[in-house]
Interface confidence: low
């Protein structure tokens, strides 16, 4: 008898999910000597254990604790780059400025980046057909809970000056409902973090507005100030030039405003 399967609103588990996670883990630990001790098979077992046989709307941060423990990693706490709605540029930046780190430059972030996964209650199967959508189905799904957990831990680890890259092309440059707005902002530790510096990335070539004056940025400033953390903001008018100058700071054109 065919077994009835819950149909969720979101896409199913990324194909070859187990192989992808394992391959990413091996690659990461090969290239990062400080993580050479990590046993990737154990990492996969812990990852799998967080969601297999569990109802995909009833996942908790506790489910991911074994994985968090295995993936414990020390990154320089004063070299953290957060981002919201502008992942590609943030990653291009840390690939050039290799002493700064986004969450996806850490092992756990790297493993899960751009992947989807979920299981089914009481079976050991991975659901490749559909997974819960955060809005339409439930927020306590395996992917959302994972990113909430690792994002909270990443923000808690930050110190000194923390940078965040924000997308100046969006209607809400700072969105309280994003992972940055709902998780990371509230888990920066005021006793460790002195300043949050926002980099607002402009989209249009001729856009010379001061987006640091945007109402949503003022809202971010207010939230941060209330948490006894200083706030500063910079416009990045030319993201292409910004990246080029990070690569090649001696270039004569890089002394002007970017």
């Amino acid at each position: 008898v065919p077994r009835w399967r819950q149909q969720w609103s979101g896409p199913g588990t990324t194909k070859r999910f187990p192989e992808t996670v394992l391959a990413r883990c091996v690659k990461y630990t090969e290239i990062h000597p400080e993580m050479r001790h990590v046993d990737c098979q154990s990492v996969w077992d812990a990852f799998k254990g967080a969601f297999i046989s569990k109802h995909p709307c009833n996942i908790t941060e506790e489910d991911y604790q074994p994985l968090m423990k295995l993936g414990t990693q020390t990154v320089p706490c004063n070299k953290i780059l957060l981002w919201s709605r502008i992942k590609d540029l943030a990653h291009q930046f840390t690939q050039v400025q290799r002493d700064m780190f986004t969450l996806e430059d850490t092992l756990l972030g790297y493993l899960a980046d751009d992947l989807t996964w979920c299981g089914e209650f009481n079976t050991s199967k991975i659901n490749y057909q559909s997974c819960p959508d955060w809005r339409k189905d439930c927020s306590n799904n395996p992917v959302s809970v994972f990113w909430k957990t690792v994002s909270r831990r990443f923000a808690e680890a930050a110190c000194d000056v923390v940078h965040v890259m924000l997308n100046g092309s969006r209607s809400k440059i700072f969105d309280k409902n994003s992972t940055f707005g709902s998780v990371e902002v509230h888990n920066l530790q005021p006793e460790k973090v002195q300043t949050l510096e926002a980099w607002v990335i402009h989209g249009g070539r001729e856009d010379s507005r001061d987006l640091c004056q945007d109402p949503t940025i003022k809202e971010l400033e207010s939230i941060i100030s209330k948490r006894n953390i200083q706030f500063s903001c910079k416009n990045i008018y030319r993201p292409d030039k910004f990246l080029q100058c990070v690569k090649n700071p001696e270039d004569s054109s890089c002394t002007s405003e970017i």
């Epitope: 290239i31 690939q95 290799r98 090649n248």
Partner: nanobody
């Protein structure tokens, strides 16, 4: 399997030239500064050259500066070490390795290098 393979070594007379190649297998070198190291008989492995992520910036150890040139190809698969005016003191096993960082501001960054290959033997002798 992520690995780097060094090649191009050999026996050469003093004053001669060699070009070493460092080829990546299993990953791209694009996002890493790459260093060349050498280990002379009975000595510690030393950093001799580094090229950053852009290919624009290079650093050399004092012992090879002006004689060796490091470069990288555009495909992101190979880094070269052109060695001119070779001396007997250049004899050793030559290794390449990717750095964690994009820049080459210092050569004493052994701990940020990983994935050592087998190396390639260079012997300078008449």
């Amino acid at each position: 399997q992520v690995q780097l393979v060094e090649s191009g070594g050999g026996l050469v007379q003093p004053g001669g030239s060699l070009t070493l190649s460092c080829r990546a297998s299993g990953f791209t070198l694009d996002y890493y500064a790459i260093g060349w190291f050498r280990q002379a008989p009975g000595k510690e492995r030393e950093a001799i050259a580094c090229i950053d992520i852009t290919g624009f910036h290079t650093n050399y150890g004092d012992s090879v500066s002006g004689r060796f040139t490091i470069s990288r190809d555009n495909a992101g698969t190979t880094v070269y070490l052109q060695m001119n005016s070779l001396e007997a003191e250049d004899t050793g096993i030559y290794y390449c390795a990717p750095a964690r960082y994009a820049a080459c501001s210092a050569l004493d960054v052994k701990l940020s290098f990983t994935s050592w290959g087998q190396g390639t033997q260079v012997t300078v002798s008449s």
